[in-house]
């Protein structure tokens, strides 16, 4: 959560001289209440817009728009405080519109916009617009709030934003999974045009439980340039337990722009559909959630071995 370049912030419009200031999110009118305060904003709208910078970057922004109520309190409106709270981190960022001239009623309803809060993919925010001065402690509230959910990098128009491209959003691995004989699974995917390593993670579950019963990680070494956009194949040997049959495969790239935080792509292979009589799970078989095996996870493509060190992937 951040602001686009401060020097560009403008809030003046015809009939109003206005400046945008940084705010501590604690306006002076909280500490020194005023007797006469304006009414609350009307029709607060938050939309996903995109800012093109002169450097060629593209950032998702929260476009905040609201109008004024057509009452006499417009005469006491000195500005507005815009607050954006990122819900998962409680990080808050505020700016203040400071009106340098008095507002007058005119033929059109006053409308204000602000689009300089840069937001992150797949995050939820609470956006609040407070009219200033804020009300006295027992006064009617003069703010409006709305939640705003930013789509993730899978969203059609988020893919080409700078933060999404930095995390590898343009790479389409087109993962395919094939079940082979002898408890084996072949995973195939398209390499991106960068010489960086990949990790393929297999986690298996029983059909009825969401506890992992098997876990393997395999490394793919950085491809050479002639291998870019080619298919890579990895073969896993699966758990010997037939009920450990619901497989979740993730491919994690390590692109230079995102390192350990690149977008992972996943596919799920459900258990095969068996006739009406489902085979019961042997209780004894199920005691270990995963089968400890020794071994390193550094294996090349098509090497059957793999580490089963247990990992949790979010």
């Amino acid at each position: 959560l951040r602001l686009l370049d401060h020097r560009a912030l403008v809030c003046s419009q015809p009939g109003l001289n206005c400046t945008v200031k940084n705010s501590t999110c604690l306006d002076d009118s909280w500490i020194h209440p005023r007797n006469l305060t304006p009414s609350s904003p009307k029709d607060l709208q938050i939309q996903l817009h995109f800012a093109h910078t002169q450097q060629g970057d593209l950032f998702p922004v929260a476009h905040i728009e609201w109008t004024l109520q057509t009452d006499a309190s417009i005469l006491y409106l000195e500005g507005a405080e815009l607050s954006v709270l990122q819900l998962n981190t409680n990080e808050r960022l505020c700016v203040r519109f400071e009106f340098l001239s008095k507002l007058r009623h005119h033929h059109r309803r006053w409308r204000f916009t602000f689009s300089h809060f840069v937001v992150d993919p797949d995050q939820e925010y609470e956006v609040t617009v407070h009219h200033l001065p804020k009300p006295i402690p027992d006064g009617d509230p003069n703010h409006q709030s709305k939640n705003f959910l930013v789509p993730d990098c899978e969203h059609a128009r988020m893919k080409v934003t700078t933060p999404c491209m930095s995390s590898g959003s343009l790479w389409d691995p087109n993962i395919t999974v094939e079940t082979l004989e002898a408890h084996q699974l072949r995973v195939s995917f398209t390499l991106w045009n960068e010489s960086t390593p990949y990790q393929v993670l297999l986690e298996s579950f029983s059909d009825s439980e969401n506890h992992s019963c098997f876990d393997v990680v395999k490394q793919i070494f950085a491809p050479r340039q002639e291998e870019f956009h080619q298919r890579a194949n990895v073969t896993f040997t699966l758990s010997k337990f037939h009920w450990c049959c619901h497989h979740h495969v993730q491919v994690q790239p390590f692109f230079s722009s995102c390192l350990n935080d690149c977008l992972r792509h996943a596919v799920t292979v459900p258990c095969p559909v068996i006739s009406n009589t489902t085979v019961p799970k042997p209780v004894a078989d199920y005691i270990p959630l995963w089968e400890p095996r020794s071994g390193s996870s550094d294996y090349k493509d098509d090497d059957d071995k793999g580490s089963s060190h247990h990992h949790h992937h979010h």
Epitope: C11, Q13, T113, F114, H116
Partner: antibody, heavy 131, light 107 residues
């Protein structure tokens, strides 16, 4: 006012490649997405794919193996190629723009856009696949 | 792919009637939905974007509402020029998909 105009052959033989061009006039190709949509006779609308002005593409998976969309910013044009056509590809083909420059006070030194689906369309060109 | 369904598939109405068309998405699409009007031999024309915002130049008798999976287009007082086919479009995820259309004709 931006206008779009599709051009290309109206008749294509089965197994050949359909090629169409959309010329953008009255505005820039930059910062927008450019789409191809088709409508088979008496049928609904089907999105074929799009291209961002920078060249990044999205294709409909049902056509992906046969479709190529490209952009030429110097000519203010973008193009569609559909290979191995059959009679099922007979349709009216439309090009369309996705994206609008946000026109509001206080934008400063940035250009703000929003992308809410196709707002400007060409008038469409009929392509018949027949031997 | 996100499947868009529209109801009704066709309706007959008179000038002055209030008309409501519903569009449902097979999964949540936020407010990434537009409504389009198409007349025979013409390209579609956008009426509503972002589920509820009126396209510039479109009469205010058209309105849109909804979010997530259920959306509505309302024509408050049907005019002679409104007899056409109406489509919804989701542009949340690729591939973009249109509803099958609702044909509005004269009763």
């Amino acid at each position: 006012q931006v206008q779009l105009q599709e051009s290309g052959p109206g008749l294509v033989k089965p197994s050949e490649t359909l090629s169409l061009t959309c010329t953008v006039s009255g505005g820039s190709i930059s910062n927008y997405y450019w789409n191809w949509i088709r409508q088979s006779p008496g049928k609904g609308l089907e999105w074929i794919g799009d291209i961002y002005y920078s060249g990044s593409t999205n294709y409909n998976p049902s056509l992906k193996s046969r479709v190529t969309i490209s952009v030429d910013t110097s000519k203010n044009q973008f193009s569609l190629k559909l290979s191995s056509v059959t009679t099922a590809d007979t349709a009216v083909y439309y090009c369309a723009r996705d994206g609008e420059l946000a026109n509001y006070y206080g934008s400063g030194s940035y250009q703000f856009y929003y992308y809410y689906g196709m707002d400007v369309w060409g008038q469409g060109t009929t392509v018949t696949v027949s031997s | 792919d996100i499947l868009m369904t529209q109801s009704p598939s066709s309706l007959s109405a008179s000038v002055g009637d209030r008309v409501t068309i519903t569009c449902r998405a097979s999964q949540g699409i936020r407010n990434d939905l537009g409504w389009y009007q198409q007349k025979p031999g013409k390209a579609p024309k956008r009426l509503i974007y972002a589920a509820s915002s009126l396209q510039s130049g479109v009469p205010s008798r058209f309105s849109g509402s909804g979010s997530g999976t259920e959306f509505t287009l309302t024509i408050s007082s049907l005019q002679p020029e409104d007899f056409a086919t109406y489509y919804c479009l989701q542009h949340n995820s690729n591939p973009f998909t249109f509803g099958p259309g609702t044909k509005v004709d004269i009763k």
